[in-house]
């Protein structure tokens, strides 16, 4: 039932869950100088009754006595920004988000945890989309993923969002409606739905990968 | 709390207009696309148009000539304006937001406003 | 546009009940969310990604299906789930509800 894959990336974006189906893993990692402790648990495990949902294990860090051997690479904050976003997580949970039954919430920061959070999704886990500061979203529907069991393999659906720089946005109108553009879809069928956006997607679906094809540079 | 209260519904001759608002609280609209849904009387539910947190839009095919949909972030406060409204644009037009961010699966609903087009 | 059909239309139960209802969709969409309303209420969310449960709603209430077919499934009828239900997709643009299944008691 674990996502065989990562969510899909999406250039310029980063992805949330806001809640955790059970079965989740979270990877306990330390930042640099700290490790787990010993006999420490290696992931904490999203578990629950039919009533509440919890997170099993604990994560704790400790400083490391020996130095580390291994070669790590901490990219700095612009690296960052452009970095592969599937499984970073940021910890903190929107207020408003109403509890869901079979989740969990975020799990609270545990002291010297490591910049990013690895998780491991299960079947049926949904994650939402955003751009990054400074890039403006465009969209042919809703900016999520939803992990799924296709013929005995795992899937993520691809979110039906592009992140585009402030300096393209004069290529989308998102002031007036356009004549009805033709449009992809993420099950490669015809779509009828009118974006202001004014773009055109095509999808490979052999890949399950899309490819955006601008109507004002390629047409 | 997230709450959604529509307003602005009420009688309109064919071929007038109005203005809907939502006014939300409880979450920034600048983290949510907010949607318009519809339901004429005795119908099953239509969709209408979302507005994303970006500000990008989506409409019904059938409708977008005569819909268009915005928000003010600042006022909390989203819009849909309706014109050359025709007899069948008769029904309860509901705000709702999704679980979360620009999602599909809408968590939120406000209570309705009745929008009755006659002559 | 994808059509959802919703069926039974209506259907008459007895409370404990185990009642399905089915949506079929005209094309393949990646999962559906089923939502139950009450006369002069507004939609309450029910499942959301085919089988996971909104918030408060019981676990007598269950989803499956994948394709073009979906199941919304109550396990034991009580008297509140005296409703109709609405599947809906955004798979694929634009987004579309069923026609909804009316749930009467016998």
């Known amino acids: 039932e674990l996502c065989d894959d990562d969510p899909p990336e999406i250039p310029h974006a980063t992805f949330k869950a806001m809640a955790y189906k059970e079965g989740t893993m979270l990877n306990c990692e330390c930042k640099r100088g700290f490790r787990r402790i010993k006999s420490g648990s290696l992931y904490m495990l999203c578990t629950g009754n039919s009533s509440h949902s919890s997170w099993d294990n604990q994560c704790q860090c400790t400083s490391s006595a020996t130095r580390n051997t291994t070669k790590q690479v901490t990219p700095q904050p612009e690296e960052q920004k452009e970095r592969k976003t599937t499984e970073m997580q940021s910890p903190m949970q929107p207020v408003d988000q109403a509890s869901l039954p079979g989740h969990c919430r975020e799990p609270p920061p545990w002291e010297n945890e490591a910049t990013e959070r690895i998780y491991h999704f299960v079947v049926g886990q949904m994650v939402y989309y955003q751009c990054v500061q400074g890039y403006r979203a465009l969209h042919r529907g809703p900016a999520e993923s939803v992990c799924k069991m296709t013929h005995g393999k795992t899937r993520w659906t691809q979110p039906q969002l592009i992140c585009t720089g402030e300096m393209e946005t004069s290529q989308f109108p998102g002031e007036e409606k356009p004549q009805a553009s033709p449009e992809g879809r993420p099950e490669s069928e015809t779509s009828c739905l009118v974006t202001t956006t004014d773009f055109q997607i095509q999808t490979e679906m052999a890949a399950t990968m899309e490819t955006s094809i601008f109507t004002t540079e390629y047409q | 709390q997230v709450q959604l209260v529509e307003s602005g519904g009420g009688v309109v001759q064919p071929g007038g207009s109005l203005r809907l608002s939502c006014a939300v609280s409880?979450?920034?609209?600048?983290?949510?696309?907010i949607q318009w849904v519809r339901q004429a009387p005795g119908k099953g539910l239509e969709w209408v148009s979302v507005?994303?947190?970006?500000?990008?839009?989506n409409y019904n095919s059938a409708l977008m000539s005569r819909f268009t949909i915005s928000k003010d972030n600042s006022k909390s406060t989203l819009y849909l304006q309706m014109n050359s409204l025709r007899a069948e644009d008769t029904a309860v037009y509901y705000c709702?937001?999704?679980?979360?961010?620009?999602?599909?699966?809408?968590?939120?609903w406000g209570q309705g406003t009745l929008v009755t087009v006659s002559s | 546009d994808i059509q959802m059909t919703q069926s039974p239309s209506s259907l008459s139960a007895s409370v404990g009940d185990r009642v399905t209802i089915t949506c079929r969709a005209s094309?393949?969409?990646?999962?559906m969310h089923w939502y139950q309303q009450k006369p002069g209420k507004a939609p309450k969310p029910l499942i959301f990604?085919?089988?996971n449960l909104a918030s408060g709603v019981p676990s007598r209430f269950s989803g499956s299906g994948s394709g073009t077919d979906y199941t919304l499934t109550i396990s034991s009828l009580q008297p509140e789930d005296f409703a109709t239900y609405y599947c809906q997709q955004w798979s694929s643009n634009p987004p579309t509800f069923g026609g909804g299944t009316k749930l009467e008691i016998k």
């Open positions: 094309s393949s969409v990646s999962y």
């Open positions: 409880g979450f920034s609209l600048t983290s949510y696309g």
């Open positions: 507005i994303w947190a970006g500000g990008s839009t």
């Open positions: 990604a085919t089988s």
């Open positions: 709702a937001r999704a679980y979360g961010y620009d999602g599909s699966w809408l968590a939120y």
